[in-house]
């Protein structure tokens, strides 16, 4: 069986301030079992943007029903974008455990923010 891949098809996305940004992410397999998390940045200081399991993310919604067992689309929408949201966003698959361990990351999507149209 082929190993799971995390696919972020968009290298970059440009959004006008005030609009919503959709960041696409799909996985190619249901195995291993475990949650998806979204981060901004890639190093030790990366910021958690969305955790499928738990947490408070008032501006983030999932594009599809990510809680369904057979779901493989983990795209997210971030509302009311501001220039402070610019950065590279990574979709990361974790393997279930105590604690969950990082399994594979997508290549990242760079979000840039355009000035609000006047």
């Amino acid at each position: 069986e082929e190993e799971l891949q995390v696919i972020q098809p968009d290298k970059s996305v440009s959004v006008a301030a005030g609009e919503s940004a959709i960041l696409h992410c799909t996985v190619t397999s249901l195995i291993p079992v475990g949650p998806i998390q979204w981060f901004r940045g890639a190093g030790p200081a990366r910021e958690l943007i969305y955790n499928q399991k738990e947490g408070h993310f008032p501006r983030v919604t999932t594009v599809s029903e990510s809680t369904k067992r057979e779901n493989m689309d983990f795209s997210i929408s971030i509302s009311n974008i501001t220039p402070a949201d610019a950065g590279t966003y990574y979709c990361v698959k974790f393997r279930k455990g105590s604690p969950d361990t990082e399994f594979k990351s997508g290549a990242g999507t760079e979000l840039s923010v355009r000035a609000k149209p006047s």
Epitope: G41, G43, P44, A45, E47, L48, G55, H56, E102
Partner: antibody, heavy 117, light 108 residues
């Protein structure tokens, strides 16, 4: 408003232990890495340790094997367990919130640790 | 480990004058350099990151420049509240995060 409040500092003898705490408020603690930075009296800043959002830990060589960083997300609190303390660990210890850019955008006021016989 | 060297150690400037000081890295850090201000008895405050981006709420009189190994912080017209110690920090993606030794800006 973002607030970081350190506690637990004090006077200890060489070889003893101390646990520092940092209570965070005003931001979603679980979403950010947090760090400890220290400053010896009259000296510059020295990075000590960082814990990522997923709990991965990083240490300066000077404290590796003696200090342990941890976080309790349910309490929005950062800890630094310091064992085998030495005179050269005497410093004000600051906790700070870390941005995804690896810079420290909010700092506490610090807690003083003095190691002396 | 990347070593950061700041110069001068102390800078004496009159209020209203321009202050410029530097930070040199032992190896390239690209644009990943930050500047902090620290006043006596206070915690450091983030001023600049990515070499030239001002942090939230930082006045326009503070500006950063440089890339690679040579960086500069400029205060265009010193105010009384700007007399402090200034530290640079390299913020490449992985620890250890290192700081320079600091530049003290004092009243002439």
């Amino acid at each position: 408003d973002v607030q970081l409040v350190e506690s637990g500092g004090g006077l200890v003898r060489p070889g003893e232990s101390l646990r520092l705490s940092c209570a965070a408020s005003g931001f979603t603690f679980t979403n950010y890495a947090v760090t400890w930075v220290r400053q010896a009296p009259g000296e510059g800043l020295e990075w000590v340790s960082l814990i990522s959002v997923t709990g991965t830990t990083y240490y300066a060589d000077s404290v590796k094997g003696r200090f342990t960083i941890s976080r309790d997300n349910s309490k929005s609190t950062l800890y630094l367990q310091m064992n085998g303390l030495r005179a050269e660990d005497t410093a004000v210890y600051y906790c700070a919130k870390v941005t995804w850019k690896n810079v420290f955008d909010y700092w506490g006021l610090g807690t003083l640790v003095t190691v002396s016989s | 480990e990347i070593v950061l060297t700041q110069s001068p150690g102390t800078l004496s400037v009159s209020p209203g004058e321009r202050a410029t000081f530097s930070c040199r890295a032992s190896q390239t850090v690209g644009s990943k350099l930050a500047w902090y201000q620290q006043k006596p008895g206070q915690a450091p405050r983030l001023l600049i990151y990515d070499a030239n981006t001002r942090a939230t709420g930082i006045p326009a009189r503070f500006s950063g420049s440089g890339s690679g190994t040579e960086f500069t912080l400029t205060i265009s017209s010193l105010q009384s509240e700007d007399f402090a110690v200034y530290y640079c920090q390299q913020h490449t993606d992985w620890p250890p995060y290192t700081f320079g030794g600091g530049t003290k800006v004092e009243i002439k």
